[in-house]
Each structure stands twice: as structure tokens, then as C-alpha cells.
């Protein structure tokens, strides 16, 4: 189940039909009932659950829950009802797998058996022991028939297995040998792909959970969008923008009669689509339901624009960002195009795709020039850094998975689809294929899938985003499919606009208020910026024509 603090509703109200009412009057999704998580925070969602048949290696709690047998009587209550530590369970009960049961019913660690010290009150731990020095794993010079496991459990913390020659220490499921003798918990969650979204490590096992808005698919164990409209995939083929419903798989034309559209993006909350036309040298916007009408296509940018090949919408702060491979710049503007400024005009060779993370205040872009790379910076243009610069040639499309905090990209020269975390670590090459990645261009991620367009195959493909498997064709015979985006409310989570939270309108900025990257708790929330012909004044808010000031960017 998801975080109960996020899942719970206020008290003293009736729950929805698909919700469960806790004793404390919280409402939780019905599917969280009897999932072995205390989502109600009073255990009421885990009471009166149907009795489960527990595995042989498990202990069955009085309320039907299953826990590992070895957790019984270990001093910690793992059963929600505490029955694993009850007097009835622990008095003269059976001991754990790593324990020895004394004659009086008490338990001592198995390694204390036959250690020539009396550990059981009745001394039964030293009864029937061979008086020989201890042997170790792989000791081949021992008397034939000697069972080292009888002495001190062979030094094993858990399971000792006697072999023809020597012995072997092993561990129960969910544990691993740390030093050939001692078992420690395996942290399955260290593998970023252990779960499709949230991984929670427990003693001896782990559990996958989903973020709010998603629910676990019981068959695949992947997280799927729980509510809202069905997700759709929107792409451009230069002359049109088309849409594919990912559930119904129906296909429609959103915008016809385009000249040369390569880049597009969406703003889900307002139902607007944004696109760049390289022939008209304009950036447009329209409501999705009116986008096919040329009268309703608003022009946001139609000046100082050469080759806008990448476009991204910051849905939180209401800005658009674009790359211009002709001007060799990266720029930002308000979503109505009214205020704009150039963020980067140096050290750009062939900037192409751009993606934004408004929640953390970062943007990412690809450059397929001679020194191909993927870079990142704050949404205000500060803290520029290179994320990927080796084993990269023609990075066309990039996309962000905000939930897993990973960036995915396609390289059309190396025929690869790769991912990396937002700080540039844990790089993974998911797919390398001249067939499926013949000339990839656009890329998008949603749920457990990654989608990409391929110009040579004239198709849209999908694959599992964690391992690159399950490659399939979503649509073919598309004729030049370029940029691609997923349209769904979960792709653009809501967040506070720092510039609006400020006491002064627009953060006190005269012109543009841009979000600053959230690197630490001390990071400024935003900085002010000025048009290209002006400079930020000493107050870091107002703009001046006099070019004496040091910088066009300042922090607040």
C-alpha cells in the first residue's frame, strides 16, 4: 500500500464506495485492506482478514498474518496482534531455525551448542558432544564421519549443512552470507529495478509499492495509473500531430496541415498543446480540442527564432523552454510568449531535445554536435553541468521519469536506448539494436514502459523501461515520426509555484521569475531574469538597459 499519510482522508465523513472506513474514521482505498500494511494507523484495515495458509517456513499469527518463523519470539512484535511474542507462543515452544531448544524448553543460539560452555540452564546444550577441536568450511583432514555442525553449529549463524568433506553455512531466503558464516539481510532495494516504483526492504524480504495515483497490477506487479482519463501518446510526423489512445489503441489526427513540426509538448491541466514549426519559424499553442482549427492556433514566439528543434513546458511555473539549433541557444518564455530570455548562447553545438523537472527546478538537454553530450542546469540557467559525455554520439530524444528520478535517451548513431539517474550515476544501457533502434528520434516514459519513434522503421516502439525487454510495435507505417509525448495527468504532478508563493507578485521580479534548482534546503526558490537587451540591477529584481551590471541572473 502507499504511504498512509498520503492515502488517508479527513475524519467524520463517509468513505467513497471504493474505500474502506477505518475505526478511526480515516478512509483508505479498499485494495489496501488486508495487504499486511497498517494503512489505517490503528490496524483496523488488517483485522478480521481471511486466514491465510502460511508457508512451512512461516509462523501464522493469530489474526492470520504470516511472518518468517525466525521472527517468532525474537523480542520484537512482527505480528500486528503481537501473537509472535505472546506467552503462549514463546513458552516451551519450538525454537527458531538458528536456535537450539534446551531440555527445559528455553532457546539458545545454535552456535552455542557444543562450545564447551553451559548455555542452557539444564546444560543440555553440551550433552552428546564430540570432544574435538572445531573444524571449518572445507576442512578435508578431519576424521571420516565427523559432523562439524554438531559443534557450535559449525560457526554458522543460521543453517549448517554437513558435507561428505567439510560443511557449509547457508542462509534462509532473503538473507545472504556476509563472511561465509554469518547471514545478513539482502537489501533487494539496492537494485533500482527491483520494483517498478517504490521498494521497501524488510528483514528477509522486500515489498513493492506504488506512488499515489498508481496501483499495483496484481498480474505483472507493475504500477499502473489508477484513475483519470486513459493515457494517450501524442506524436508529430512533421506534417501532422497525431494521437494514439494507449488503452483503446484508437488513432486520431490532432493537428493537420503542418509544414515541418519536429518538437511538441503538452500542458495537461489546461489541455493545451505546444509545437514548433521549423518552416514557419514559430512556436504555437492551442487547446487540444481546437488545435486543428488554424484560426485558433496562437503564436507564442515568432521572432528571433531559427530552428526550434526541442520544446518543453514547465507546467508548474507556466514557462516554455526551447532549443534552437540555428541560433545555438536555449531560451525560456512565459507560456503566452509575452516575456522571454536566452539562457544559454555559448558552448552549444547542435542542441536538440529538452526536458524539464519543475519539481526540482532542473532542465536537461541533448547536444548531438562533435562533442555529443547530455547536459543539465537549473531552470533559471544556473549550475550548468554535463551529465553524459562518453559513449554518446547522436542523442536525439530525451525524457524524464520524475518518479524514478531517471533520464532516458536514444542514440541514433549507436542504436541504443539508455538511462541514467538525475545526478549522472547508475547509467544503464537498456537496448542496443540496429533493428528496433535503427534511427530513433523521440522518446517518452509512462508506467512500466518506454516508448520511442524510429524514422527508418517509420514506427513507434515500446519496451519495459526497467530491463529493455518486451519490445513491441505500437504503430507502424507512420512516415517520419519525430517527437513523442505521453498525455496523462500523472505525467505532470502539481506543485507550488515559488514565484506565486512570494509576497510580491512575480517574486518581485520586474520581468521573468524563474525557478532555481533545489540542490539543498538553503537553495533560493527562484531568481529574476531580464530580456536579452537588458541587465539585472543590483537589487536582483529590476532590469536596466545600462550594461555595467555583472550578470543577467540573480538569486532571491
Amino acid at each position: 500500500a502507499a504511504d498512509p499519510l498520503l492515502g488517508g482522508q479527513g475524519p467524520a465523513k463517509e468513505c467513497e464506495k471504493d474505500q474502506f472506513q477505518c475505526r478511526n474514521e480515516r478512509c483508505i482505498p479498499s485494495v489496501w485492506r488486508c495487504d499486511e500494511d497498517d494503512d489505517c494507523l490503528d490496524h483496523s484495515d488488517e483485522d478480521d482478514c481471511p486466514k491465510k495458509t502460511c508457508a512451512d517456513s512461516d509462523f501464522t499469527c493469530d489474526n492470520g498474518h504470516c511472518i518468517h518463523e525466525r521472527w517468532k519470539c525474537d523480542g520484537e512484535e512482527e505480528c500486528p496482534d503481537g501473537s509472535d511474542e505472546s506467552e503462549a507462543t514463546c513458552t516451551l515452544g519450538t525454537c527458531h531455525g538458528n536456535e537450539f531448544q534446551c531440555g527445559d524448553g528455553t532457546c539458545v543460539l545454535a552456535i552455542k551448542r557444543c562450545n564447551q560452555e553451559q548455555d542452557c540452564p539444564d546444560g543440555s546444550d553440551e550433552a552428546g558432544c564430540l570432544q574435538v577441536p572445531p573444524t571449518f568450511l572445507g576442512n578435508r583432514r578431519r576424521p571420516r564421519g565427523l559432523n562439524e555442525c554438531l559443534h557450535n553449529n559449525g560457526g554458522c549463524s543460521h543453517i549448517c549443512t554437513d558435507l561428505k568433506i567439510g560443511f557449509e553455512c547457508t542462509c534462509p531466503a532473503g538473507f545472504q552470507l556476509l563472511d561465509q558464516k554469518t547471514c545478513g539481510d539482502i537489501d533487494e532495494c539496492k537494485d533500482p529495478d527491483a520494483c517498478s516504483q517504490i521498494c521497501v526492504n524488510y528483514k528477509g524480504y522486500f515489498k513493492c509499492e506504488c506512488y499515489p495515483g498508481y496501483e499495483m497490477d496484481l498480474l505483472t506487479k507493475n504500477c499502473k495509473a489508477a484513475a483519470g482519463k486513459s493515457p494517450s501518446l501524442i506524436f508529430t510526423n512533421r506534417h501532422e500531430v497525431r494521437r494514439i489512445d494507449l488503452v483503446k489503441r484508437n488513432y486520431s489526427r490532432l493537428i493537420p496541415m503542418l509544414k515541418n513540426v519536429v518538437a511538441l509538448d503538452m500542458e495537461v491541466a489546461t489541455n493545451r498543446i505546444y509545437w514548433c514549426d521549423l518552416s514557419y519559424r514559430k512556436i504555437y499553442s492551442a487547446y487540444m480540442d481546437k488545435a486543428s482549427d488554424p484560426k485558433e492556433q496562437e503564436v507564442l514566439i515568432d521572432e528571433q527564432l531559427h530552428s526550434p528543434e526541442g520544446l518543453a513546458v514547465d507546467w508548474v511555473h507556466k514557462h516554455i523552454y526551447w532549443t534552437d539549433s540555428g541560433n545555438k541557444t536555449i531560451s525560456v518564455a512565459t507560456v503566452d510568449g509575452g516575456r522571454r530570455c536566452t539562457l544559454f548562447s555559448r558552448n552549444l553545438s547542435e542542441p536538440r531535445a529538452i526536458a524539464v523537472d519543475p519539481l526540482q527546478g532542473f532542465m536537461y538537454w541533448s547536444d548531438w554536435g562533435n562533442q555529443a553530450k547530455i547536459e543539465k542546469s537549473g531552470l533559471n540557467g544556473v549550475d550548468r553541468q554535463t551529465l553524459v559525455s562518453d559513449n554518446i554520439e547522436w542523442p536525439n530524444g530525451i525524457t524524464l521519469d520524475l518518479l524514478s528520478q531517471r533520464l532516458y535517451w536514444v542514440d541514433s548513431k549507436l542504436h541504443q536506448l539508455s538511462s541514467i539517474d538525475f545526478s549522472g550515476g547508475n547509467r544503464k544501457m537498456l537496448i542496443s539494436s540496429t533493428d528496433f533502434l535503427s534511427h530513433p528520434f523521440g522518446i517518452a516514459v509512462f508506467e512500466d514502459k518506454v516508448f520511442w519513434t524510429d524514422l527508418e522503421n517509420e514506427a513507434i516502439f515500446s519496451a519495459n523501461r526497467l530491463n529493455g525487454l518486451e519490445i513491441s510495435i505500437l504503430a507502424e507505417n507512420l512516415n517520419n515520426p519525430h517527437d513523442i509525448v505521453i498525455f496523462h495527468e500523472l505525467k505532470q504532478p502539481r506543485a507550488a509555484d515559488a514565484c506565486k508563493l512570494s509576497v510580491q507578485p512575480n517574486g518581485g521580479c520586474e520581468y521573468l521569475c524563474l525557478p532555481a534548482p533545489q540542490i539543498s534546503s538553503h537553495s533560493p526558490k527562484y531568481t529574476c531574469a531580464c530580456p536579452d537587451t537588458m541587465w539585472l540591477g543590483p537589487d536582483m529584481k529590476r532590469c536596466y538597459r545600462d550594461g555595467n551590471e555583472d550578470s543577467k541572473m540573480g538569486s532571491t
Epitope: M257, P294, K295, E298, V299, Q304, D336, G338
Partner: antibody, heavy 117, light 107 residues
Framework: EVQLVESGGGLVQPGRSMKLSCAAS????????MAWVRQAPTKGLEWVAT????????YYRDSVKGRFTISRDNAKNTLYLQMNSLRSEDTATYYC??????????WGQGTLVTVSS | DIQMTQSPPSLSASLGETVSIECLAS??????LAWYQQKPGKSPQLLIY???SLEDGVPSRFSGSGSGTQYSLKISNMQPEDEGVYHC?????????FGAGTKLELK
């Protein structure tokens, strides 16, 4: 409702100047390129000039280049056409237009400019 | 500039009749063609865009067709309110250019 209202037309002598205005309402003025199209009496339509959304780019038909200046004031939602060195062949009804992609979407009612001595 | 040749310059039709107006572009305009109707003393109104897309509120008796350089406007079931001048316009390249117009009268 989109409304475009032209003003400033009238009788003017050849070689003199005249400025046309167009007051726009009912839409986000700064989000659309604006144009002037003219129609000489009993003749066809003729595109004259277009201005980009922020006024930074202007486009003219060859016969008016250097004589006419199209401009806009987004704060006032107003489009202008400054016409200098007027000629008799400039006599026409001038229409203020909100452009759409590849077409002339909305037209004003027009203002007549007569160039005559 | 792209030249637009419209024909015929004028025509008259009886009530209920079907009429066609042709427009020929000097080069391929890839369906970037609009038709406008101008009633006497009024400003032109958009009828059809992208060669065959009917503007909202325009009666379905109006239809557009064509591709490449040749386009036509068809008015089936001629009505008295259809009288006026019809203009074609290419939007493929700047400068956008118009045909000379076709005057349609009711017989």
C-alpha cells in the same frame, strides 16, 4: 467575440500621409500576427502587410515597401498602418485582419482610403 | 510570388442549381487553400480552409476539393443568400495571394 474596428480612412492627396488604426477586442491580441489587406473598388483582394506578435518582424508587399509601416501596440490592443507618399493606386478599402495559420481568419468592416487631388 | 487564377470571373445560377468555381495556383500549394465569401458592402468571411475543411457555421451545401495546383469550390442547391463574390487564397508561401474573385448572381 472577435472584433476588429478600423478607423482613420478618408480622402487624402497624392504624396501625403495617412495613419490607419484598428482596435481589437475579444481575443488575446498579442497571441496572433496581424495584417492589412486592401481591395480597390470593383477589384480583387490584395495583401498589404503583416506584423509578428510582438511587433519585431514586419512583412510588406513589394509595391508598398519603404512607404508603408505596419506596427502594433499590444498594451492598447491596437494595430496601425502608417501610409506615406500615397499614390492614386493605393485607393482601396483597407481591412484589418487577425491572421490564422496560412489564412486570414477574422476581418474588420474596412475603412476606405481615397487618394485623389 | 504564387499566382492564383480564378475562373470564371462571374456566373449566374438558378435557385437549387449546383455551381463550381475553379482556382489554379502557379505552383503546388499542398492544399493550403482558403475560400472566402464577400457579400455586397461587407467584408470577406472565411468559408473553407485547407482546401476542403468547412468553417464552423457554414452550410454543408458548400464544399471544397482539389490538390496540387487545382482547386474548386462547389455550391450545391444555390440559395439567394449565396449571392456575392468568392475569393480563393493560397497560404502556402508568403506573400499570401488571392485570386481575382468570382461574382455569383442568382438568375
Amino acid at each position: 467575440e472577435v472584433q476588429l474596428v478600423e478607423s482613420g480612412g478618408g480622402l487624402v492627396q497624392p504624396g501625403r500621409s495617412m495613419k490607419l488604426s484598428c482596435a481589437a477586442s475579444g481575443f488575446t491580441f498579442s497571441s496572433f500576427p496581424m495584417a492589412w489587406v486592401r481591395q480597390a473598388p470593383t477589384k480583387g483582394l490584395e495583401w498589404v502587410a503583416t506584423v509578428s506578435t510582438r511587433g519585431g518582424h514586419t512583412y510588406y508587399r513589394d509595391s508598398v515597401k519603404g512607404r508603408f509601416t505596419i506596427s502594433r501596440d499590444n498594451a492598447k490592443n491596437t494595430l496601425y498602418l502608417q501610409m506615406n507618399s500615397l499614390r492614386s493606386e493605393d485607393t482601396a478599402t483597407y481591412y484589418c485582419i487577425r491572421e490564422g495559420t496560412s489564412l486570414f481568419a477574422y476581418w474588420g468592416q474596412g475603412t476606405l482610403v481615397t487618394v485623389s487631388s | 510570388d504564387i499566382q492564383m487564377t480564378q475562373s470564371p470571373p462571374s456566373l449566374s445560377a438558378s435557385l437549387g442549381e449546383t455551381v463550381s468555381i475553379e482556382c489554379l495556383a502557379s505552383e503546388d500549394i499542398s492544399n493550403y487553400l482558403a475560400w472566402y465569401q464577400q457579400k455586397p458592402g461587407k467584408s470577406p468571411q472565411l468559408l473553407i480552409y485547407y482546401a476542403n475543411s468547412l468553417e464552423d457555421g457554414v452550410p454543408s451545401r458548400f464544399s471544397g476539393s482539389g490538390s496540387g495546383t487545382q482547386y474548386s469550390l462547389k455550391i450545391s442547391n444555390m440559395q439567394p443568400e449565396d449571392e456575392g463574390v468568392y475569393h480563393c487564397q493560397q497560404g502556402y508561401n508568403y506573400p499570401y495571394t488571392f485570386g481575382a474573385g468570382t461574382k455569383l448572381e442568382l438568375k
